[in-house]
């Protein structure tokens, strides 16, 4: 039998995400993060 | 509020065609993921599912009627139209239409029912 | 086509007493999505069907809590903890995974 239309079953789960870079000081290079839901994973 | 009222001719001969019309309120038939489903349960018996129309037009039917079923929809008038050719006194029932909404936003089920309308056919 | 078969087909019950339909496919109806489309309706005398619980086990927004569903495959069964007056009618399963959409035959719940 075929298959009734549905959704994929998966909901996305829309976020902004944010790349930043900061200086931290003369001899630390920079830092570069990854703010998802405005907690740094990277 | 949500509502859907069917109507039909309630009394026609065998081999006529009958034509029925859902008429939706409170909802758009141009929703993204909405849908209009008709059902039949004859009297005293259970229930039984005719056909679905989506949003897209795109359309599903059950293939033991589907050579005598044609479903679709008017969303100017936000109206679904069922027809169902060569009638027969086997197709004496209640007939109703009910919504289902895909995705987020609905439960996809059947979450609101019409009150439905008897066709009695006989010669 | 998948059959759906519902035991018992009638259910005298005690106001107060618990009740259980099961509800049973002759195939499995987990969707290609990895979601299980099973669904119950209750028709009450002189009424439209009306949505209990969908998706085997989410309760329709209203639908007091006395009522339940679960399984998964081909088993399924609807609960109500406490049986009130208001619950009388019939009780029917729905797949809606695969085409066409197909019923139980129904189970009449009275009150004793």
């Known amino acids: 039998d075929a298959e009734f239309r549905h959704d994929s079953g998966y909901e996305v789960h829309h976020q902004k995400l944010v790349f930043f870079a900061e200086d931290v000081g003369s001899n630390k290079g920079a830092i570069i993060g990854l703010m998802v839901g405005g907690v740094v994973i990277a | 509020q949500v509502t859907l009222k069917e109507s039909g001719p309630g009394l026609l001969k065998p081999t006529q065609t009958l034509t029925l019309t859902c008429t939706l309120s409170?909802?758009?038939?141009?929703?993204?993921?909405?849908?209009v489903g008709w059902f039949r349960q004859p009297p005293g018996k259970g229930l039984e599912w005719l056909a679905h129309i989506w949003w897209d037009d795109d359309k599903s039917y059950n293939p033991s009627l589907k050579s005598r079923l044609t479903i679709s929809k008017d969303t100017s008038k936000n109206q679904v139209v069922l027809t169902i050719t060569n009638v027969d006194p086997v197709d004496t029932a209640t007939y109703y239409c009910?919504?289902?909404?895909?995705?987020?936003?609905?439960?996809?089920?059947?979450?609101?029912w019409g009150q439905g309308t008897t066709v009695t056919v006989s010669s | 086509d998948v059959v759906m078969t519902q035991t018992p087909l009638s259910l005298p019950v005690t106001p107060g007493q618990p009740a259980s339909i099961s509800c049973r496919s002759s195939q499995s109806i987990l969707h290609s999505n990895g979601n299980t489309y099973l669904e119950w309706y209750l028709q009450k005398p002189g009424q439209s069907p009306q949505l209990l619980i969908y998706k085997v086990s989410n309760r329709f927004s209203g639908v007091p809590d006395r009522f339940s569903g679960s399984g998964s495959g081909t088993d399924f069964t609807l609960k109500i903890s406490r049986v009130e007056a208001e619950d009388v009618g019939v009780y029917y399963c729905l797949q809606t995974t695969r085409v066409p959409l197909t019923f139980g035959q129904g189970t009449k719940l009275e009150i004793k």
């Open positions: 009910a919504r289902r909404q895909l995705g987020t936003r609905g439960t996809d089920a059947m979450d609101y």
């Open positions: 409170g909802f758009s038939l141009s929703t993204s993921g909405m849908g």
